[in-house]
C-alpha cells in the first residue's frame, strides 16, 4: 500500500470521438491501479504530443482499439 | 445547446464563505472537466480551479489553494465552488466553463458576481 | 510562473487588418495550444481560435490564428474589421496543470 493515497489519473475530460489513426503518435492503455481508481485510454497526438483522453466505455473507442490493435498484429512478423 | 448558468453569488463580509453553483445542460457532463475563472471589476480573466470529469483530479491557482473547493454531482448536472475566508481580492464575476479536452475552455456561463465587502 | 503578455490596447479603422499578440514569459509557447477568446462589454468570454489555428464553426474566417516560434509568440489576426469585433480579446494556454490567461487586449474599431 503507498505511503501517499493521492489519486494521480490523468484525464480531465473524455472523448466519446475516435482519434484519426494517423494522427496517433502512440495509444496507452492504463489499467486501473490503487493510484488511479479506473480504466485510462491515453492518445499521445503527434502534434505536439498532445494527449486526448478516450472513453473506454464508448462503442466508437472500442471499435478504435480494435483497428489498432488489428493493424499493429499485420506489422508484427 | 450547451447552456451553463452559474448562481449562488451576492455580497458577503471578508473571512466569510459562500457557495457558488453551476447548472450544466445541453451536453453528457459526466464527460467533461469544468473550470472556474473569474474576472474583478474592469480586470481581466483569471483561473480559478479545474475539475475531471469524474472528480477525481482538481487543480487550484495559487491564489485560491486551501481556500477554496472544486466539486461536482454528476447526478445533478452541477458544479460547484466552496469559497472559504474570503478576501477582497476575491471579488469578481465567476464563470464556469467547460473542458473538451486538457486544455481550451470552449463553453462559458454568463456569470455570477461576488462582492466582498465589510 | 509561466506568463503571457499582450498589448493593452489597439485599434484599426473598419475593413482594415490587425494583429494582437501574446507573447510567452519562458518556455516555448509552441510546445502547448493557444487558445484566444472574445469578450464583449458585458457579456461572457467565448472561443474565436482554439489549439493554436483552429476556429469554431460559428466563427468567421476573418478571424486567424498562428504560432511563431523564433518571438515566442502567439497571434491572433482579423481582417475586415468591424465595429461589432470591438471586444476585450484574451489569449490562453497551459502549463503543468496550470491554465494561464494573457492581461486582455482591447480592441476599438474607429
Known amino acids: 500500500v503507498p505511503l501517499s493515497r493521492t489519486v494521480r489519473c490523468t484525464c480531465i475530460s473524455i472523448s466519446n470521438q475516435p482519434v484519426n489513426p494517423r494522427s496517433l503518435e502512440k495509444l496507452e492503455i492504463i489499467p486501473a491501479s490503487q493510484f488511479c481508481p479506473r480504466v485510462e485510454i491515453i492518445a499521445t497526438m503527434k502534434k505536439k504530443g498532445e494527449k486526448r483522453c478516450l472513453n473506454p466505455e464508448s462503442k466508437a473507442i472500442k471499435n478504435l482499439l480494435k483497428a489498432v490493435s488489428k493493424e499493429r498484429s499485420k506489422r508484427s512478423p | 445547446q450547451v447552456q451553463l448558468v452559474e448562481s449562488g453569488g451576492g455580497v458577503v463580509q471578508p473571512g466569510r464563505s459562500l457557495r457558488l453553483s453551476c447548472a450544466a445542460s445541453?451536453?453528457?457532463?459526466?464527460?467533461?472537466?469544468m473550470h472556474w475563472v473569474r474576472q474583478a471589476p474592469g480586470k481581466g480573466l483569471e483561473w480559478v480551479a479545474v475539475?475531471?470529469?469524474?472528480?477525481?483530479?482538481?487543480y487550484y491557482a495559487d491564489s485560491v489553494k486551501g481556500r477554496f473547493t472544486i466539486s461536482r454531482d454528476n447526478s445533478k448536472n452541477t458544479l460547484y465552488l466552496q469559497m472559504n475566508s474570503l478576501r477582497a481580492e476575491d471579488a469578481a464575476v465567476y464563470y464556469c466553463?467547460?473542458?473538451?479536452?486538457?486544455?481550451?475552455?470552449?463553453?462559458w456561463g454568463r456569470g455570477t458576481l461576488v462582492t466582498v465587502s465589510s | 510562473n509561466f506568463m503571457l503578455t499582450q498589448p493593452h490596447s489597439v485599434s484599426e479603422s473598419p475593413g482594415k487588418t490587425v494583429t494582437i499578440s501574446c507573447t510567452g514569459s519562458?518556455?516555448?509557447?509552441?510546445?502547448?495550444?493557444v487558445q484566444w477568446y472574445q469578450q464583449r462589454p458585458g457579456s461572457a468570454p467565448t472561443t474565436v481560435i482554439y489549439?493554436?489555428?483552429?476556429?469554431p464553426s460559428d466563427v468567421p474566417d476573418r478571424f486567424s490564428g498562428s504560432i511563431d516560434s523564433s518571438s515566442n509568440s502567439a497571434s491572433l489576426t482579423i481582417s475586415g474589421l468591424r465595429t461589432e469585433d470591438e471586444a476585450d480579446y484574451y489569449c490562453?494556454?497551459?502549463?503543468?496543470?496550470?491554465?494561464?490567461f494573457g492581461g486582455g487586449t482591447k480592441l476599438t474599431v474607429l
Open positions: 466553463a467547460r473542458a473538451p479536452d486538457g486544455h481550451q475552455l470552449d463553453y
Open positions: 445541453g451536453f453528457t457532463f459526466s464527460s467533461y472537466g
Open positions: 475539475i475531471s470529469y469524474d472528480g477525481s483530479i482538481k
Open positions: 519562458s518556455g516555448s509557447i509552441a510546445s502547448n495550444y
Open positions: 489549439e493554436d489555428d483552429q476556429r
Open positions: 490562453q494556454s497551459y502549463v503543468s496543470s496550470k491554465w494561464v
